[in-house]
Every structure is written in structure tokens, then in C-alpha cells.
């Protein structure tokens, strides 16, 4: 089975990295040693000028990582995979199209108020951005999603996304535990990051 | 070779609008990023707005100064690529260059905004 | 975003001298992100060098460029009648893409 890229991702616009499927011959690793060689952008230059991968540790095993001095959100790339010479696997892409936030992070949630039945209360649930998102001077807007549910429930309720890194939730049974967690996006973007830890909500009775 | 060719720039009144095309030959059109740039009379350069291709979702990118009131677009059919400026201001004359990715350029075209 | 400041303004020298002109950015910029553009009057911006150091096709090979970080250089060798021009640098590394001021060469 030839190695195949799984994923690129860009944390905050500034840096990404790329990951592959081991190559697997026979239930054994492929002999062959797998590089990834990476190119920007094909205008001048008559022949495209292939690099190999700048950094193939920090982003783990079967990755590549490419820190700020390799990151332009203003020219496209093109990758691939080689074994032998050959090329097993390749994909073309912009670093905004990978770009996918790290969780949020420090939920935590205060009472609103009590229904007058003392059957349902609202909360506020806040959260603050991924440390690395640079979202003060713009360069990372970002839009988020909050999903919560009943502790013994399977199905999540999806909120609307939201700019704001606060929003209530109304209705909640008070005699229930409830559990919270939010994603964020780039807004404009398709591709949402990964869910905060979940935040477990019990109302008093 | 490549061969960038703007038209569609003349004088405008503040608050009006105007179109520029530009006509694009010797390379794939499709696959290219397009970028407009300006420069204002005896200024420098300043970027305007980027479209990419249908691979990178034609996706647009504009800068502050113009978000809002200018539009790019693209017709791949065509071979064109486009600017449409509503609400012009005086700031905005300058001689508005089509470009690939910048690096090939159009000689431009002269948007006018004068009352 | 980043803004790139060149020096001088102006360069007064004579065909057959060496011209160094600096770029100095705000901020660090990669050095695979930063280029330089000719423009004669009257005439496009045609792209000179990029990542650099890089020269673009067709660009004779007194043109060349270095730097790294927050200062960035483009050196003519021997000025030719035809380079007395504006000369602007250009990153696209961070922010929006931004361009310098420009430095104009003369003839002196």
C-alpha cells in the first residue's frame, strides 16, 4: 500500500505541516524512504523547482512541517510524496484553504438566571481564543460553534456560529448535567478545528 | 509569452463607478492567481485585490482601503479578469495594473475621479 | 502590516557605478517572499528579482539582490544606461502584500 497525504493543516496562517499514511508492503514498512518535496509557484521558473521537506521531526512521524519562514498566505503550493524517485502521491493548495484553529480554550460557564418554575435555567458560556491565533490585528477571524448536550445523551445540540467568544444558553433542565464544548473556524473558511475540552455544566437545584 | 491587457479606466465623478477589464493570453488562465495593483500620480505601488483560481475556490482577498466598494471577479471562458469599483473617492486615481500573481503586469489603465 | 522603507529616496550616479539600494521592513520578513521591480517612466513595473536573490528571466546578471530578516539589498554592478529608473521592493510573506516607497536612480 503506497503512502498517501491524510492531512494539511495550518494552525493560526503562519506555519502548517502535512501528514501521510506509512507505506506498507506486505505488512512490512516499505523499503524505499519516503520524502516530501514542496514547491511555490511555477512563473519564473521554466522548470519547477522541487525542495524537500524542511523540517520532517516536529510535526511527528510521516510529517513535514514548515514553520513562518516557509508560510506565505499569498502564493500557491504543490507537494508530493516520493519513494524511490517516484512520486506516490501529490496535492496543490493555498495555506488558507488548510486552515483549521486550535481548540479554544478556558471554558467556563456562570448562571444567568432561574426559571420562575425552578425547572430550566439560562447560563452564559465563555472561552478564550487559540493562544495562537493572532486575532488582534486580524489576521485570524475567527467564527466559533458551541455544541452541548445531556451527560447520557449521544446527540450533540449545535448553536449558530458566533464572532463573539460568550453566548448563552437557554433552557437548561436544572436537575441534569450538561456537557459544553466549542470549535472555531476561519471565517469564511470550511473547515472548522478541533473541539475544546468539554466543560461540564451541573445547575443547582 | 505573457500578455496582460487593462481597459475599461477613464474619468468618474465621486461616488460613481467603473469597470475594468483586463484581457489575458500566453499562459493558463484558469490555473492563475490574479492580482490588481494601483499607483496613484507620481506615487508608488500599492496592492489592491487578489482572486485566485476555480482549484483555490476563487477565492478574493482585498486590501482595507477598498474593501467594500471594489469588487474582482474573473471569467475563465473569457480569459478576462475584472474589477468593478463602486463609490469611488478622489484617492482612488491612480493607474490600476492587471497582474499574474505580480509578477507579469499589464501597462495599466488611468481611473479618474474627479467631480 | 508590514511596511518596507527603501533608501535613499534618491541616487544620483554616473553610468558604469555601483548602486545599493536597501529595503528595511518592519517587521522580519522570509526571504523567499521578498522581490524587486523596475519601473521606467511611463511604463509597467517589470519584476527584477524575487525570493531575493532570484533574478527573474531575462534580467542580465549585473542585477542582484541579498538580505534576510528586516534589511534586504539590491546592488547594480555597473550602472547601464537603460537602469536609471524607480526601483520598489515587495514582500508578500505576512499581512497583505505591501510594497516600498521606491528608490529613484539618476543619472548624475
Known amino acids: 500500500k503506497e503512502p498517501k497525504f491524510t492531512k494539511c493543516r495550518s494552525p493560526e496562517r503562519e506555519t502548517f505541516s502535512c501528514h501521510w499514511t506509512d507505506a506498507v508492503h506486505h505488512g512490512l514498512k516499505s523499503l524505499g524512504p519516503i520524502q516530501l518535496f514542496y514547491t511555490r509557484r511555477n512563473i519564473q521558473e521554466q522548470t519547477q523547482e522541487w525542495k524537500e521537506c524542511p523540517d520532517y521531526v516536529s510535526a511527528g512521524e510521516n510529517s513535514c512541517y514548515f514553520n513562518s519562514s516557509f508560510t506565505s498566505v499569498w502564493i500557491p503550493y504543490c507537494i508530493k510524496l516520493t519513494s524511490n524517485g517516484d512520486t506516490v502521491d501529490g496535492k496543490c493548495f493555498s495555506v488558507d484553504e488548510i486552515v483549521q484553529p486550535d481548540p479554544p480554550i478556558a471554558l467556563n460557564w456562570t448562571l444567568l438566571n432561574v426559571s420562575l418554575t425552578g425547572i430550566h435555567a439560562d447560563i452564559q458560556v465563555r472561552w478564550e481564543a487559540p493562544p495562537n491565533a493572532d486575532i488582534q490585528k486580524g489576521w485570524m477571524v475567527l467564527e466559533y460553534e458551541l455544541q452541548y448536550k445531556e451527560v447520557n445523551e449521544t446527540k450533540w445540540k449545535m448553536m449558530d456560529p458566533i464572532l463573539s467568544t460568550s453566548v448563552p444558553v437557554y433552557s437548561l433542565k436544572v436537575d441534569k448535567e450538561y456537557e459544553v464544548r466549542v470549535r472555531s473556524k476561519r471565517r469564511n473558511s470550511r473547515n472548522y478545528g478541533e473541539f475544546s475540552e468539554v466543560l461540564y455544566v451541573t445547575l443547582p437545584q | 509569452e505573457v500578455q496582460l491587457v487593462e481597459s475599461g479606466g477613464g474619468l468618474v465623478k465621486p461616488g460613481g463607478s467603473l469597470r475594468l477589464s483586463c484581457a489575458a493570453s500566453?499562459?493558463?488562465?484558469?490555473?492563475?492567481?490574479m492580482d490588481w495593483v494601483r499607483q496613484a500620480p507620481g506615487k508608488g505601488l500599492e496592492w489592491v485585490a487578489e482572486?485566485?483560481?476555480?482549484?483555490?475556490?476563487?477565492?478574493?482577498y482585498y486590501a482595507e482601503s477598498v474593501k467594500g466598494r471594489f469588487t474582482i471577479s474573473r471569467d475563465d471562458s473569457k480569459n478576462t479578469l475584472y474589477l468593478q469599483m463602486n463609490s469611488l473617492k478622489t484617492e482612488d486615481t491612480a493607474v490600476y495594473y492587471c497582474?499574474?500573481?505580480?509578477?507579469?503586469w499589464g501597462q495599466g489603465t488611468l481611473v479618474t475621479v474627479s467631480s | 502590516e508590514i511596511v518596507l522603507t527603501q533608501s535613499p529616496g534618491t541616487l544620483s550616479l554616473s553610468p558604469g557605478e555601483r548602486a545599493t539600494l536597501s529595503c528595511t521592513a518592519t517587521?522580519?520578513?522570509?526571504?523567499?517572499?521578498l522581490n524587486w521591480y523596475q519601473q521606467k517612466p511611463g511604463q509597467a513595473p517589470r519584476l527584477l528579482i524575487y525570493?531575493?536573490?532570484n533574478l527573474a528571466s531575462g534580467i542580465p546578471d549585473r542585477f542582484s539582490g541579498s538580505g534576510s530578516g528586516t534589511d534586504f539589498t539590491l546592488t547594480i554592478s555597473r550602472l547601464e544606461p537603460e537602469d536609471f529608473a524607480v526601483y520598489y521592493c515587495?514582500?508578500?510573506?505576512?499581512?497583505?502584500?505591501?510594497f516600498g516607497g521606491g528608490t529613484k536612480v539618476e543619472i548624475k
Open positions: 497582474t499574474l500573481i505580480r509578477d507579469y
Open positions: 500566453g499562459f493558463t488562465f484558469s490555473d492563475a492567481w
Open positions: 482572486i485566485r483560481s476555480k482549484a483555490n475556490y476563487h477565492a478574493t
Open positions: 517587521s522580519s520578513v522570509s526571504s523567499s517572499y
Open positions: 525570493s531575493t536573490s
Open positions: 515587495h514582500q508578500y510573506h505576512r499581512s497583505t502584500p505591501t
